[in-house]
């Protein structure tokens, strides 16, 4: 139950990539406003996005405090201009979100190939170690800093002149692959967390090809 002029939020959905985490919900408010609360299973509720007419709330600052915790959020509905009003049960109407564990569920953002360098018949491909909003000791941690060896990268590479793809994997952000002399190759990488049950893979990075500016060629 609730007041006659408010409706409960619904379709509460977590949208999270590389720990940038936003809670979204419906409906667009008509004569009502929302406040969001978030907590861990064992923690106290903390209010965010007070009396907003938005249907989203950025909860990144809260979840990055401990990305391995499981979080629950709830969205309260209040009549516009009368936020003290409560439902018949003595509290405002609210709806709970699904549980969310950032470490296990945040989407892996599209990776970027930082550089590639050819030395003879070997090419070293380096994946950019993207910065996250997770902080430790006042510094922002990279994706590798957070996930450690849980994160691997898969490299797809192929001759520019053909479509047959080869793959390599690495537990670091670097690959060292064998190539045919005199051939140009194209590369794309994907981030993967093999131990996950959901959101295991990122989208593929933009394709980078030899003979373009990003790489460096050295014949030895």
């Amino acid at each position: 139950s609730g007041t006659t002029n408010t409706v409960a939020a619904y379709n509460l959905t977590w949208k999270s990539t590389n720990f940038k985490t936003i809670l979204e919900w419906e409906p667009k408010p008509v004569n009502q406003v929302y406040t969001v609360q978030i907590s861990t299973k064992s923690g106290d509720w903390k209010s965010k996005c007070f009396y907003t007419t938005d249907t989203e709330c950025d909860l990144t600052d809260e979840i990055v405090k401990d990305v391995k915790q499981t979080y629950l959020a709830r969205v309260f509905s209040y009549p516009a201009g009368n936020v003290e009003s409560t439902g018949s049960a003595g509290e405002p109407l609210y709806e709970n979100s699904p549980e969310f564990t950032p470490y296990l569920e945040t989407n892996l953002g599209q990776p970027t190939i930082q550089s590639f360098e050819q030395v003879g018949t070997k090419v070293n491909v380096t994946v950019e170690d993207e910065r996250t909003l997770v902080r430790r000791n006042n510094t922002f941690l990279s994706l590798r800093d957070v996930f450690g060896k849980d994160l691997i990268y898969t490299l797809y590479y192929w001759k520019s002149s053909s479509s047959g793809k080869k793959t390599a994997k690495t537990n670091t952000n670097e690959f060292l692959i064998d190539v045919d002399k005199g051939e140009n190759y194209c590369f794309s990488v994907q981030a993967v967390i093999p131990s996950r049950t959901v959101n295991r893979k990122s989208t593929d990075s933009p394709v980078e090809c030899m003979g373009q500016e990003k790489g460096e060629f050295r014949e030895i």
């Epitope: 430790r136 800093d145 490299l155 994997k169 690495t170 670091t172 060292l176």
Partner: antibody, heavy 125, light 108 residues
Framework: QVQLQESGPGLVKPSQTLSLTCTVS?????????WSWIRQHPGKGLEWIGE???????RYNPSLKSRVTISVDTSKNQFSLKLSSVTAADTAVYYC??????????????????WGKGTTVTVSS | EIVLTQSPGTLSLSPGERATLSCRAS???????LAWYQQKPGQAPRLLIY???SRATGIPDRFSGSGSGTDFTLTISRLEPEDFAVYYC?????????FGGGTKVEIK
Amino acid sequence: QVQLQESGPGLVKPSQTLSLTCTVSGGSISSGQYWSWIRQHPGKGLEWIGEIYYSGSTRYNPSLKSRVTISVDTSKNQFSLKLSSVTAADTAVYYCARDAPYYYGGGYYYYMDVWGKGTTVTVSS
Amino acid sequence: EIVLTQSPGTLSLSPGERATLSCRASQSVSSSYLAWYQQKPGQAPRLLIYGASSRATGIPDRFSGSGSGTDFTLTISRLEPEDFAVYYCQQVGVVPYTFGGGTKVEIK
């Protein structure tokens, strides 16, 4: 050349917390390697306890996870193991080790290539 | 948990002989994640082989590794006196990392 040295009490009472420290010399603990703890029960095989990255990212053996904490102190070039609620079954030689990346098949994978000498911990009243 | 079973438990051989040690995994292990270690009494283990077949720095070429999937082998082509020790296989692909129970290579 990197060297590792375990230190800590050799005798711990049942139900107490075992605390060991591994000091890294000849290299930086922040240089992109992982740091592990492994133990070996008397006359038995090896058991991996867990690992840590300089950033604090950890992975633990699920069989010990509820009792284990591994932490890192980059300013002292050390990492530590705490094992709570110990019993006689935790009596073992405890090793610290470095996990360094090795090239294989187009990528790099981590292996425990440098080990400390080990320290014997006995749990007894 | 991936269980690694090593056989035989003990191998009694003479110097100069060939030693073949087996490691069988309870489920498939990528070669990228398989290692072999040597341990002598009172010492820490020493990395011999990584990636199932690549020798670690300073390891003599009489040591070789092979295999894929669930079956891996460490071969010592000609045993030297210093090779008598316990050998462990290890997988580092799935948490918890696990070791085999070990094969003791002893002097016959």
